[in-house]
C-alpha cells in the first residue's frame, strides 16, 4: 500500500533528525504525490499509445485543466507569494474533480490513484493554513463538478484514455510549477 509522507517511505526525501518545518512537510508531500503520478503515468503509457499521441491538443481543448500562467505570480518573472499561493490552492481544488474521475481508470495502480487523491486533499489543507488571503480562493461548485464528471465518464474509450493521460500530465506540470514556486517562499 502507498505510504504517506511522514511514514516510512524510500520514495521521499530522507528523514530529518529534527521535526520537519511546515515548508519541508509541504515540499515532501508534493514530491510524494509526484511519485504517485509517475507510477500512474507508467501504467497509462504502457497500456495505450496516448503518451506519444499528436491528437493531444484536440482533446485538450475540451478540458479546462488548471494551468500556471505568468499572471499567477508563480514564475520567477513577476513572482508574487500571495497571488501564487491563491493560484496553487485554487488550482488544486479545481483538479479534485479530475482526480475523482481517475479513480476507476486504473487496474494495477488503483491504490496509487486513491493515494494521489487523498494526498492532494491533505496538501490543500496544509496550504490553506499557510495562505493569508483565504477569501480570494474560489471553490468549484459541487453541481458543476458533478455534471463535468458525468460528461467525462460518458466519453468513448479513446477519449477516456486521452483524458486520463492529459489529466496526469497537466497535474504533474501544475505540481512541479507549484513546488518550484513554494521553494521561493
Amino acid at each position: 500500500a502507498p505510504v504517506l509522507p511522514g511514514e516510512d517511505s524510500k520514495d521521499v526525501a530522507a528523514p530529518h533528525s529534527q521535526p520537519l518545518t511546515s515548508s519541508e512537510r509541504i515540499d515532501k508531500h508534493i514530491r510524494y504525490i509526484l511519485d504517485g503520478i509517475s507510477a500512474l503515468r507508467k501504467e497509462t503509457c504502457n497500456r495505450s499509445n496516448m503518451c506519444e499521441s499528436s491528437k493531444e491538443a484536440l482533446a485538450e481543448n475540451n478540458l479546462n485543466l488548471p494551468k500556471m500562467a505568468e499572471k499567477d505570480g508563480c514564475f520567477q518573472s513577476g513572482f508574487n507569494e500571495d497571488t501564487c499561493l491563491v493560484k496553487i490552492i485554487t488550482g488544486l481544488l479545481e483538479f479534485e474533480v479530475y482526480l475523482e474521475y481517475l479513480q476507476n481508470r486504473f487496474e494495477s495502480s488503483e491504490e496509487q490513484a486513491r493515494a494521489v487523491q487523498m494526498s492532494t486533499k491533505v496538501l490543500i489543507q496544509f496550504l490553506q493554513k499557510k495562505a493569508k488571503n483565504l477569501d480570494a480562493i474560489t471553490t468549484p461548485e459541487p453541481t458543476t463538478n458533478a455534471s463535468l464528471l458525468t460528461k467525462l465518464q460518458a466519453q468513448n474509450q479513446w477519449l477516456q484514455d486521452m483524458t486520463t493521460h492529459l489529466i496526469l500530465r497537466s497535474f504533474k506540470e501544475f505540481l512541479q510549477s507549484s513546488l518550484r514556486a513554494l521553494r521561493q517562499m
Epitope: 526525501a13 530522507a14 514530491r31 509526484l34 500556471m68 500530465r169 506540470e173 518550484r180 521561493q184
Partner: antibody, heavy 123, light 107 residues
Framework: QVQLVESGGGLVQPGGSLRLSCAAS????????MTWVRQAPGKGLEWVSS????????AYADSVKGRFTISRDNAKNTLYLQMNSLKSEDTAVYYC????????????????WGQGTQVTVSS | DIQLTQSPSSLSASLGDSVTITCQAS??????LSWYQQKPGQTPKLLIY???KLQTGVPSRFSGSGSGTSFTLTISGLEAEDLATYYC?????????FGQGTKVELK
C-alpha cells in the same frame, strides 16, 4: 541516441546580440526541462537559464536577467537563447543540457550535454 | 540566493586512495544536489543526482551523501580516469548555482 547540438555562437561586439540554438534528437523533447549552462575560459560552470516543459515557466541567473531570453519550439525540437546587450563577461562556452526525466520528476540534474558553442564578446 | 561552498578547491591523491569532496549550502536545499565530473577539453558528466542517487553507467566507486545543507561526494579507490574537476549544483531554488569546483590531481 540522445543528441544535443548547439549553434549560433561567434564573435560579437559589446552591446551586440546573438541567438543560440540547440537542436535536440533521440528523445521526446517536449517532455523535458532544458537548461543553458556556460563556462568562461579557465573558469567553473555557471547555470544560466532553464525552461520547463509545458508551463512556459522560465528562470534566469541574476547575471543575465533582463538581457537573455530562453525559449523553445517543441515542434522543431529546438531550444533557443536570445542574448542581448552582451558584455565581455558573457564570453564563454555555452552548453545546452537536458534535465533528468522519466520517473525522476522533481530532482534537478543534467544528464545530457551538447558539445557547446563558443561566444566571444570583444571589441 | 543560496550560496554553495565547495571544498577543497583542489586536492592531490594517490591512485587507490579514498577521496572526499564537500559542498555546503547556505540554507537547506533538501536533497536537490547533483554532482558533475569534467575532464579537460570535455563536457561535464552527471555522476550523482538527488544527493545520493548514482546516475546510470557511473562506476559504483562514486557515492554521494547528505541532505539539508551538507553534502559529500566520495570516490572510493581513486583511478587514473577519475582525475578531473568536480562540481556540485543546487537545484532547489532559483537561481540555481554550481559550486566553484574541486580539481583532483595525482600526488
Amino acid at each position: 541516441q540522445v543528441q544535443l547540438v548547439e549553434s549560433g555562437g561567434g564573435l560579437v561586439q559589446p552591446g551586440g546580440s546573438l541567438r543560440l540554438s540547440c537542436a535536440a534528437s533521440g528523445f521526446t523533447f517536449s517532455n523535458y526541462y532544458m537548461t543553458w549552462v556556460r563556462q568562461a575560459p579557465g573558469k567553473g560552470l555557471e547555470w544560466v537559464s532553464s525552461i520547463y516543459s509545458f508551463s512556459g515557466d522560465t528562470a534566469y541567473a541574476d547575471s543575465v536577467k533582463g538581457r537573455f531570453t530562453i525559449s523553445r519550439d517543441n515542434a522543431k525540437n529546438t531550444l533557443y537563447l536570445q542574448m542581448n546587450s552582451l558584455k565581455s563577461e558573457d564570453t564563454a562556452v555555452y552548453y545546452c543540457t537536458r534535465n533528468l526525466g522519466g520517473v525522476v520528476v522533481t530532482t534537478n540534474g543534467y544528464d545530457y550535454w551538447g558539445q557547446g558553442t563558443q561566444v566571444t564578446v570583444s571589441s | 540566493d543560496i550560496q554553495l561552498t565547495q571544498s577543497p578547491s583542489s586536492l592531490s591523491a594517490s591512485l587507490g586512495d579514498s577521496v572526499t569532496i564537500t559542498c555546503q549550502a547556505s540554507q537547506s536545499i533538501s536533497d536537490e544536489l547533483s554532482w558533475y565530473q569534467q575532464k579537460p577539453g570535455q563536457t561535464p558528466k552527471l555522476l550523482i543526482y538527488g544527493a545520493s542517487k548514482l546516475q546510470t553507467g557511473v562506476p559504483s566507486r562514486f557515492s554521494g551523501s547528505g541532505s539539508g545543507t551538507s553534502f559529500t561526494l566520495t570516490i572510493s579507490g581513486l583511478e587514473a580516469e577519475d582525475l578531473a574537476t568536480y562540481y556540485c549544483l543546487q537545484g532547489y531554488r532559483w537561481p540555481f548555482m554550481f559550486g566553484q569546483g574541486t580539481k583532483v590531481e595525482l600526488k
